[in-house]
Amino acid sequence: KEVVLLDFAAMKGELGWLTHPYGKGWDLMQNIMDDMPIYMYSVCNVVSGDQDNWLRTNWVYREEAERIFIELKFTVRDCNSFPGGASSCKETFNLYYAESDVDYGTNFQKRQFTKIDTIAPDEITVSSDFEARNVKLNVEERMVGPLTRKGFYLAFQDIGACVALLSVRVYYKKCPEMLQSLARFPETIAVAVSDTQPLATVAGTCVDHAVVPYGGEGPLMHCTVDGEWLVPIGQCLCQEGYEKVEDACRACSPGFFKSEASESPCLECPEHTLPSTEGATSCQCEEGYFRAPEDPLSMSCTRPPSAPNYLTAIGMGAKVELRWTAPKDTGGRQDIVYSVTCEQCWPESGECGPCEASVRYSEPPHALTRTSVTVSDLEPHMNYTFAVEARNGVSGLVTSRSFRTASVSINQTEPPKVRLEDRSTTSLSVTWSIPVSQQSRVWKYEVTYRKKGDANSYNVRRTEGFSVTLDDLAPDTTYLVQVQALTQEGQGAGSKVHEFQTLSTEGSANMAV
């Protein structure tokens, strides 16, 4: 953007510039060009030698300018177009300026002026051009600065040329007010900060409802000496609840939302949310639907799952396998886990209590992702109820629970009751019993025995009957003996570990360690 401080051509001759010496040298003239009057200051004292004719502008108020640009349009006659070549003829003139805080009026002093440059034409107007009225217009531009006083004068010194000054335009440059990346940059005077830093850094301000992104850089632009904006740095983003429309941030329409400052547009409210109002930063969940803390606001609201489907409990001796299928309604989530709880009831009293401490699960019973688990170490003649609960990421936000239960009675064989029937120095005869009602379920009995104090080796005997004789034993030695029933479902409960002692070789019943 150019701000004009002085425009001779535009003033249509109304500028009364000072000439020195007065009445000699420079003269204001009017010509007709394209049926329009044009004004010019001209001088053409080429024959007389030693010319020193000055033309001074009126005082020009500097405004905010630090550097001014001076654009001159002029013609210069070819010295050879004059008779004899006019030995004192020149084809250049000099440009001066002087700064001041006040208008000196007609008080003109050459010594106050500083030379800017010698102005030479690119093209000179020769005789034939002049006669054909085909004058060669030259355009020259010079820069002056930095200026510090309130105003200034320009002066043109003729030293014997034939010059016509058609236009003098003085202006300074500004980088215009600008909107870029949702930031407003103010109109800025084009100045070089220094010779090594020819750009001025200008901070922008975010437009309404735009913000600098968290951790990001604020908007900056560089204003060049030529009044051009360069190299944008940083940006503004429309804040939550607003989206970019051209160079502004507009509130999200009803039914849309935007949860953070970003370049993205407003998003439509997801499933199972209530319609949002204008400028919404989120959409509230419908009643009965929820958002887990880690759920993005763009995700549909979800609800806890229904209970697991088809829970079955398959008893296997002292074990039970629980199997179930996923809930029919997942609540719209994939993060379903299951937890199993156990309750045992004593059939004789009907009293019930938790049994987590006394049973063993094949894997930890909380946060299961699989749909089966095996529970072992169940007690015989006990009723068990297992509850399988389905949970997802929003189950913790409600008090209700979604579970299915299955009950099972354990009829595992009772541990055999073992006793020592007979013994010798090298053998032990052991017998056992179980309730008659359970005998048909037993396939075989397994007798495990080892020397007391020898934990590293043991012997196993299997039998279908209710007794066994363990022989090839050491005299006067204690043996640890255990009997376990084997059923079609697997191992029944084991008996106690009994301590039985062989006779000593002296025939006495001395005990051994």
Epitope: L420, R423, K452, A455, H498, E499, Q501, L503, M511
Partner: antibody, heavy 130, light 109 residues
Amino acid sequence: QVQLQQWGAGLLKPSETLSLTCAVYGGSFSDYYWSWIRQPPGKGLEWIGEVNHRGSINYNNYNPSLKSRVTISVDPSKNQFSLKLTSVTAADTAVYYCAKPLRPHCTNGVCYSGDAFDIWGQGTMVTVAS
Amino acid sequence: SYVLTQPPSVSVAPGQTARITCGGNNIGSKNVHWYQQKPGQAPVLVVYDDSDRPSGIPEQFSGSNSGNTATLTISRVEAGDEADYYCQVWDSSSDHLVFGGGTKLTVLG
């Protein structure tokens, strides 16, 4: 009916040796494994070890956590058994009990290791303090 | 070494049934004994061999043992039953005697 009477020093300094004796009145001394048990203030019971004297041999069995410092011996002529615990510290402050098992160790080839204790001594409070 | 786990405390109203558990790996294969200890007194045997009572112990004390849990049941609890209760087993693998950590029974009201 068997009775147990115990005695010994009640106040010790760190690094000294704790010494307690338990006398058995009534019953067959050599048929049983005799035990020492202790209970620190406000805490649970801890088995120290056991001894049985048969013929001329002592059969000992100690808690692994105390084994390096403990000795349980027998004086069969007096029907007494004793506990010695060396290098005591404040952590050994406790009530110390002697105890008799419910049944003889072995009867007709059936043995009862770690049997229930049906008779206990009156307890001796031993304090270790500097 | 073999470990017996008891709940630190159990509370029950008078006249109700108290159940004190003692957990241990395959404890069902071992004989479990139970003691009652009142403040300042030596322990008293109340149940031996899982479920047998010594003479003089009332029948309101009973026991069971299966799998990994032994249970002492005190029916019709009264204020005089308030005490610490300990379970005990013999670990035949190491030939050492082991006590549980004890359970404080509180009779409410």
